[in-house]
């Protein structure tokens, strides 16, 4: 009984859980789970039957493809749910979707550790702030990616005069958004206005 | 967890009804049925009914057919089995059973511990 | 209503055997059966579904198999704790019925 999906989306947009096959034939009973135990809805040839849970309000089942469609998703519906189905034969048969609900993230604020002019050469060291976050880090400057082992919130590098870059960027990334915050330099080694 | 907490032993008289409960706990009461299954001395398993927490949906075996009433009570999740006109072949264990679904299915995964009920005179 | 008849009415075993309880429905009945335990003075405990799905928590010792009308009951290695009456119930159609019962005692 595996048929384990996984899908991510982002916080407070709706959501539709459902399986790529078409369900079984003339099925007797319909169930949608979530953490394995707590039934959300089921639907049993006569009707669709909404159950005590955080859920309901905001879900529908559709009974033809046992579809299940969650308004204004939030980060705490993150779990595996389970759509079970009982057959006419008397035989169940489980789908699983492990969802995975994310905020998305806020504009980083890109903070200035230390600017060196060390012999017409640059020390830079920038730290990328977001609070408590796991997402991907890219720094650009001039728009042009740094190379990816420099790619971690804080960006620390000592640059030559000819690969000075007025504005360095950092992108902040999850699976489902992205935002940058940006600062700039005014040649050689001295911050300019933001 | 979950667990089905029935009622204790009764002794009645012939002619006499029962009302046995049995309070559920550790899962959505409303998500699942309810059999009510009995067992006499030394004898084999003898499905009685079944009633959907839900909306009160009964099918009560034939040979039970106007002597026995299921009800539930879903603000204190508990399912009750009333047996009337009570004779001396009554005398049994009655259990309560968790169906897997909202509707009837047919099987049972948790099963309350039992209440005897003894008719004699 | 469907009858069901199970066979043996009574075994007798070693820890470490293996053993099969037959049931056989008196109409096809698909894959709607389970099979139960019950030790003395206690409330029975479910074990298969739909014929051969395992409940929750049941160990993997126990094994369900059939479909239509014959349907078997396996215990791949006597435990102490199994010996007990097993029960097959239909659940195809109301009123749901159950096997006399099998009686698993010590050799």
């Known amino acids: 009984q595996g048929h384990l999906v996984h899908m991510t989306v982002v916080s407070g947009s709706n959501v539709t859980l459902n399986i790529s096959e078409s369900l079984p034939e003339n099925y007797k009973q319909l169930t949608w789970f979530y953490t394995f135990d707590q039934k959300i809805v089921e639907w049993d040839s006569r009707k669709s039957k909404y159950f005590e849970s955080k859920f309901k309000g905001r879900v529908r089942l559709d009974p033809q493809s046992g579809a299940l469609y969650i308004s204004k998703v939030q980060k705490e519906d993150n779990s595996t749910y389970i759509m079970r189905v009982l057959k006419k034969t008397g035989n169940e048969q489980e789908w699983k979707i492990k969802l995975q609900v994310l905020d998305p993230v806020p504009k980083p604020v890109i903070k200035i550790e230390k600017i060196e002019d060390m012999d017409d050469n640059c020390y830079l060291k920038l730290s990328c702030v977001i609070p408590g976050e796991s997402v991907n880090y890219t720094w650009y400057g001039d728009k042009r990616p740094f190379p990816k082992e420099l790619q971690n919130s804080v960006l620390e590098t000592t640059l030559m005069p000819h690969n000075y870059s007025r504005c360095y960027t950092c992108q902040v990334s999850n699976s489902v958004s992205s935002k940058n915050g940006t600062v700039c330099l005014s040649p050689p080694c001295t911050l300019a206005r933001s | 967890q979950v667990q089905l907490v029935q009622s204790g032993a009764e002794v009645k008289k012939p002619g006499a009804a029962v009302k046995v409960s049995c309070k559920a706990s550790g899962y959505t009461f409303t998500a699942y049925g309810i059999s009510w299954v009995r067992q006499a001395p030394g004898q084999g398993l003898e499905w009685m009914g079944w009633i959907s927490a839900y909306d009160g949906d009964t099918n009560n075996a034939q040979k039970f057919q106007g002597r026995v009433t299921m009800t539930t009570d879903t603000s204190s999740s508990t399912a009750y089995m009333e047996l009337r006109s009570l004779g001396s072949d009554d005398t049994a264990v009655y259990y309560c059973?968790?169906?897997?679904?909202?509707?009837?299915?047919?099987?049972?995964?948790?099963w309350g511990q039992g209440t005897l009920v003894t008719v004699s005179s | 209503d469907i009858q069901m008849t199970q066979s043996p009415s009574s075994v007798s075993a070693s820890v470490g055997d293996r053993v099969t309880i037959t049931c056989r429905a008196s109409?096809?009945?698909?894959?709607?059966l389970a099979w139960s335990q019950q030790k003395p003075g206690k409330a029975p405990k479910a074990l298969i579904y739909?014929?051969?799905s395992l409940q929750s928590g049941v160990p993997s010792r126990f094994s369900g198999s059939g479909s239509g009308t014959d349907f078997t009951l396996t215990i791949s290695s006597l435990q102490p704790e199994d010996f007990a009456t097993y029960y097959c119930q239909q659940a195809n159609s109301f009123p749901y019925t159950f096997g006399q019962g099998t009686k698993l005692e010590i050799k």
């Open positions: 059973a968790r169906d897997r679904y909202s509707s009837s299915s047919g099987y049972f995964d948790y």
């Open positions: 739909a014929a051969s």
């Open positions: 109409q096809d009945i698909s894959s709607w």
